[in-house]
């Protein structure tokens, strides 16, 4: 029975189950294409455990292979606006360190109004993860429409 | 080697890795936008290591972060049918107890055939999950097109 | 603290935390369907931690549950294009050895230019993974448009 | 066919406040992006502000930000503008504009509604 | 912010063809907005008129017809507005609007009288 005491003594940070789930507060600025997001059990079912907001961008705390997915859903959307709106892009990636700048999962809003799409990816503690949106529209705000998590995998 | 051994000796359930595959069954009646799920090996690939099938909707027995995914293709579709039938919307949530009640994940099919996606959210013994396909069009019950399942990621 | 010092001492392959991610190395010759894949830290963010690659194709080597994840963008493409080149369809599946040959996962591309999805599914040592590309658009080579990985769950 | 019919217009004195309203019909009003816009004495347009599904969003221009506030009860399908601490400079002919799938377009307008700001 | 320009008035005859422009500030790129069109008679609301990123990406507004169509002009950074087969009943104000996450600027309108 000893691992599992020992599991239940140790915190769960040790056992690099480092994992966050975060809901979009708010857009940039004109000129910025980032999307900014917020987590916590008080706005609702999102969280971090490990990873950290820096500014509404997520900044991870342990190396490892993390999981990394997201939706982004459009606020006004439908299939007749999708076909016709302004090419709509969202991009997730690394963003600082700048020497560690990457592009990890890009997607494209064809003539669709939702992306959803998750990828395995080495990260590194200090990395500040990025979710870039370009285009003229506004995502949606629903929490089960749009949000973005990390999930530490292994070493 | 001491890990390794009580790693084995422990029953993986107290480890914590719930984890449960589901295959299409039936839809609901017309007033009941339910998907009804099955799972088990003599289905071919679906299974459930921890959570149980109640009526085709699943429940949870250990309280945790899921990653909860699902994947539904319509059954006799194009990108013109998807687009004329209008709203189609599948939405994942708890639906029992009462209580916990929330929407967990919603996409809609405007010009397409196969909505896909998946996040992290907190769930709790007793949790069930419902799976609310709006619309009138019809799901394909092939295994590898249409499917819903959790991962218990971390208490 | 003797878990966390017998996790550091055992290797990472005996906690079964297979897992690979990889890209897009090159399309076959025009009968042959299917994607051909590669990994490693010299081409970027694709890896192999157990799992192998034998002629660009995925072979798993440890039983248990995998979570099988997929993005692949089309690579001149607009939501015109998807449309006239339909059907355009993406399958996961086992494909050797051939007694266990079995299509896991099936997208088109309807009016989109990109798919992307997952699925939890147990597979076997030995199980090799083909994921094959049927129209005749071609894959986008770019590392976060195309990728292909899978993380081992459970026994 | 998306409609609007504004009112609530009048003669307000300067510091004074009002709210106009404008009720909406033939269109999922909840899933649209909703906009006043006014036309001075002779001008041009000017946008105001909006506000874009489920009341998720809202933006104002620079002229009118704090002023002025966005709002809408979905159960009625009605859009609201409360304009407080009201200026001569704000005396106009305020349009509702809907747009039932798009939001950066103003499709559907209504005949106006005046308001004047003097003493 | 994003400003736009519009010339005060155009002139052209019934039959011929006009176009409207509404250039963006050096600031901004017309590629970055959505440039829609509005046109309002005296006395009458404006009606939307249409839209335009490319032509694939357009849109026309219910009852307009064809014979007013966009364009843009990257060079100029200016968003068109193209009548062909100019008739008297297209006399009227013509305003431009550029939109970007959640914010409209509208030109200052240009007048079109019909000779």
């Known amino acids: 029975q000893r691992f599992a005491q020992a599991q239940q003594q140790l915190p769960l940070e040790s056992l690099g189950w480092d994992v966050a789930e975060l809901q979009l507060n708010h857009t940039g600025p004109q000129q910025d294409p980032r999307l900014y997001w917020q987590g916590g059990p008080a706005l609702g079912r999102s969280f971090l455990h490990g990873p950290e907001l820096d500014k509404g961008q997520l900044r991870i705390h342990r190396d490892g292979i993390y999981m990394v997915h997201i939706q982004v859903t459009l606020a006004i959307c439908s299939s007749t606006t999708a076909s016709r709106h302004h090419p709509t892009t969202l991009a997730v990636g690394i963003c600082s360190p700048a020497s560690r700048s990457i592009s990890l999962l890009r997607l494209s809003f064809h003539q669709g109004c939702t992306i959803a799409s998750q990828r395995l990816t080495p990260l590194a503690r200090g990395d500040t993860l990025c979710t870039n949106l370009t285009g003229t529209l506004l995502p949606s705000r629903n929490t089960d429409e749009t949000f973005f998590g990390v999930q530490w995998v292994r070493p | 080697q001491r890990f390794a051994q009580a790693q084995q000796q422990l029953p993986l359930e107290s480890l914590g890795w719930d984890v449960a595959e589901l295959q299409l069954n039936h839809t609901g009646p017309q007033q009941d936008p339910r998907l009804y799920w099955q799972g088990g090996p003599a289905l071919g690939r679906s299974f459930l290591h921890g959570p149980e099938l109640d009526k085709g909707q699943l429940r949870i027995h250990r309280d945790g972060i899921y990653m909860v995914h699902i994947q539904v293709t319509l059954a006799i579709c194009s990108s013109t049918t998807a687009s004329r039938h209008h709203p189609t919307t599948l939405a994942v949530g708890i639906c029992s107890p009462a209580s916990r009640s929330i929407s967990l994940l919603r996409l809609s099919f405007h010009q397409g055939c196969t909505i896909a996606s998946q996040r992290l959210t907190p769930l709790a013994r007793g949790d069930t999950l419902c799976t609310n396909l709006t619309g009138t069009l019809l799901p394909s019950r092939n295994t590898d097109e249409t499917f819903f399942g959790v991962q218990w990621v971390r208490p | 603290q003797r878990f966390a010092q017998a996790q550091q001492q055992l290797p990472l392959e005996s906690l079964g935390w297979d897992v690979a991610e990889l890209q897009l190395n090159h399309t076959g010759p025009q009968q042959d369907p299917r994607l051909y894949w590669q990994g490693g830290p010299a081409l970027g963010r694709s890896f192999l931690h157990g799992p192998e690659l034998d002629k660009g194709q995925l072979r798993i080597h440890r039983d248990g549950i995998y979570m099988v994840h997929i993005q692949v963008t089309l690579a001149i493409c607009s939501s015109t294009t998807a449309s006239r080149h339909h059907p355009t369809t993406l399958a996961v599946g086992i494909c050797s050895p051939a007694s266990r040959s079995i299509s896991l996962l099936r997208l088109s591309f309807h009016q989109g230019c990109t798919i992307a999805s997952q699925r939890l599914t147990p597979l076997a040592r030995g199980d090799t993974l083909c994921t094959n590309l049927t129209g005749t658009l071609l894959p986008s080579r770019n590392t976060d448009e195309t990728f292909f990985g899978v993380q081992w769950v459970r026994p | 066919q998306l409609q609007v019919v504004e009112s609530g217009g009048g003669l307000m004195q300067p510091g004074g406040s009002l709210r106009l309203s404008c009720a909406a019909s033939g269109f999922t009003f909840s899933g649209s992006a909703m906009s006043w816009v006014r036309q001075a004495p002779g001008k041009g347009l000017e946008w105001v502000s909006s506000i874009y599904s489920h009341s998720m969003y809202t933006y104002y221009a620079d002229s009118v930000k704090s002023r002025f506030t966005i709002s809408t009860d979905n159960a009625k399908n009605t859009l609201y503008l409360q304009m407080n601490s009201l200026k001569p400079d704000d005396t106009a002919v305020y349009y509702c504009?809907?747009?039932?799938?798009?939001?950066?377009?103003?499709?559907?307008w209504g005949q106006g509604t005046q308001v004047t700001v003097s003493s | 912010q994003a400003v736009l320009t519009q010339p005060p008035s155009l002139s052209a005859s019934p039959g011929s063809s006009v176009r409207l422009t509404c250039t963006l500030n050096?600031?901004?790129?017309?590629?970055?907005?959505?440039i829609s069109w509005y046109q309002q008679k005296a006395g009458s609301p404006p009606r939307y008129l249409l839209y335009y990123y490319s032509d694939s990406l357009s849109h026309q507004g219910s009852g307009v017809p064809s014979r007013f169509s966009g364009s843009t002009d990257a060079s100029a950074n200016a968003g068109l507005l193209l009548i062909s087969g100019l008739q008297p009943e297209d006399e009227a104000d013509y305003y431009c609007?550029?939109?970007?996450?959640?914010?409209?600027?509208f030109g200052g309108g240009t007048k079109l009288t019909v000779l």
């Open positions: 050096s600031a901004n790129s017309v590629g970055s907005y959505d």
């Open positions: 504009a809907a747009s039932s799938d798009y939001e950066g377009l103003f499709v559907s």
């Open positions: 609007s550029a939109y970007n996450r959640g914010s409209h600027v």
